[in-house]
């Protein structure tokens, strides 16, 4: 039978999405116990029938990976969780509409920072996602977001930063002092979706100038 308040058993049912990996998470309510079991269903916008997610039926953990099931970038999805307590009480709660394009957050980019004597080179590596193209190959963030660009900053001292940005993958900050430590930060930006990744940070030191030794 249904509890007086579903929140007694189940709370905060939501998608947590990063780089298009879409994980459904939830919390137990104040009357939830370790032996409460959870079953997950999902569906797309306007569809009548909920689909049971295999591998996420009568589980005790509080997360379920729905990345494969929610892989259409233009689709809207819902998921819902039904909690059943050891005493047979049940509660069901559903997520808000979920759009991976809209809701996914961006992880810091994968960057290689290379020290030189008077410059620092930064090479941004393409970010793979679980999204597959029609031919089966995995799309990168750059494939998905056509207006994606990188914003790079090099902290020279407390009052001075150098900035670079663009769509290319290789950048170089020139005119630096040899044998000096710098802090680089690199972010992914997607203006049309108002997305900005957390920064990748590298602390690098220019090489000493051996020409004077």
């Amino acid at each position: 039978h249904a509890p007086e308040d579903p929140s007694d058993l189940l709370q905060h049912v939501k998608f947590q999405s990063s780089n298009f990996e879409n994980i459904l998470t939830w919390d137990s309510g104040p009357e939830g116990t370790p032996d409460t079991v959870y079953s997950i269903e999902y569906k797309t916008y306007g569809e009548r029938d909920w689909v049971a997610k295999k591998g996420c039926q009568r589980i005790t953990r509080k997360s379920c990976n729905l990345t494969v099931e929610t892989g259409n970038l233009t689709e809207l999805y819902y998921a819902r969780v039904t909690a059943v307590s050891a005493g047979g009480r049940s509660a069901t709660k559903m997520t808000d509409r979920f759009s991976s394009l809209q809701h996914t957050t961006l992880k810091p980019p994968d960057v290689t920072c290379i020290s030189k004597v008077r410059s620092i080179q930064m090479i941004v590596h393409p970010t793979p996602t679980p999204i597959r193209a029609g031919d089966g190959h995995r799309l990168t963030l750059e494939d998905i977001f056509h207006d994606l660009f990188y914003h790079l900053e090099l902290q020279v001292n407390r009052t001075y930063q150098m900035h670079l940005g663009g769509k290319q993958r290789e950048y170089e900050f020139f005119g630096l002092t040899p044998d000096t430590e710098f802090l680089g930060t690199i972010m992914i930006c997607v203006p049309t979706w108002a997305k900005e990744s957390a920064p990748y940070m590298c602390r690098v030191k220019t090489l000493p100038d051996r020409t004077w030794t």
């Epitope: 049912v13 916008y45 306007g46 819902r80 509660a91 069901t92 709660k93 559903m94």
Partner: antibody, heavy 116, light 113 residues
Framework: EVQLVESGGGLVQPGGSLRLSCAAS????????MNWVRQAPGKGLEWIGE????????TYNQKFKGRFTISVDQSKNTAYLQMNSLRAEDTAVYYC?????????WGQGTLVTVSS | DIVMTQSPDSLAVSLGERATINCKSS????????????LAWYQQKPGQPPKLLIY???SRESGVPDRFSGSGSGTDFTLTISSLQAEDVAVYYC?????????FGQGTKVEIK
């Protein structure tokens, strides 16, 4: 069997307020979206807005935003429509209707008459 | 807002004959994700709430007689009652769920000739 029962309608003066209720039975209200739709006498249907009863997230027809508020009491398996600053043109039958796109179950409706 | 326009406003058809109601939207209702159209049809009898007949423009709701069918795509849609029965006398509404706010047509009244 899914059932939706509206209540709370009646006669109210212009400028007044009214809260309509929609009691759901036969399913958990948190399992599907809930909408409010109204129909003026002899007229067509007008969508007011929706709520996700699990999260409380609402979307309104801009026409009603600010005056009408949709909410849910999960423990009572009931949705509400709070209507403020009522006008004569708000006279209508108010329905609650289930689902997130089109509407598969409707209540019988409750009549709201705004008149002095 | 998407404007839904139904025609005709009223329709008189003999028992057993075909009734056709049209619905036109002010923009396309084709949903790119599934290539279906975000359009539903409802039947409303006097003193009753609307009843869902058709969704996704052509999917018949469970329990709805197969004399009711929906067709069309993009901006032009049709509800057909293949053989009108006495119990089909009602007002019929189309509704779009492509974008907020969801909007309805003004309704078409179907009567017996």
């Amino acid at each position: 069997e899914v059932q939706l029962v509206e209540s709370g309608g009646g006669l109210v003066q212009p400028g007044g307020s009214l809260r309509l209720s929609c009691a759901a039975s036969g399913y958990s209200i948190t399992a599907e979206y809930m909408n409010w739709v109204r129909q003026a006498p002899g007229k067509g249907l007008e969508w007011i807005g929706e709520i996700n009863p699990s999260t409380g997230t609402t979307t309104y027809n801009q026409k009603f935003k600010g005056r009408f508020t949709i909410s849910v009491d999960q423990s009572k398996n009931t949705a509400y429509l709070q209507m403020n600053s009522l006008r004569a043109e708000d006279t209508a039958v108010y329905y609650c209707a289930r689902f997130d796109a089109y509407f598969d179950y409707w209540g019988q409706g409750t009549l709201v008459t705004v008149s002095s | 807002d998407i404007v839904m326009t139904q025609s005709p406003d009223s329709l008189a058809v003999s028992l057993g004959e075909r009734a056709t109601i049209n619905c036109k939207s002010s923009q396309s209702l084709l949903y790119s994700s599934n290539q279906k159209n975000c359009l539903a049809w409802y039947q409303q009898k006097p003193g009753q709430p609307p009843k869902l007949l058709i969704y996704w423009a052509s999917s018949r709701e469970s329990g709805v007689p197969d004399r009711f069918s929906g067709s069309g795509s993009g901006t032009d849609f049709t509800l057909t009652i293949s053989s009108l029965q006495a119990e089909d006398v009602a007002v019929y509404y189309c509704q779009q769920y492509y974008s907020y706010p969801f909007t309805f047509g003004q309704g078409t009244k179907v009567e017996i000739k």
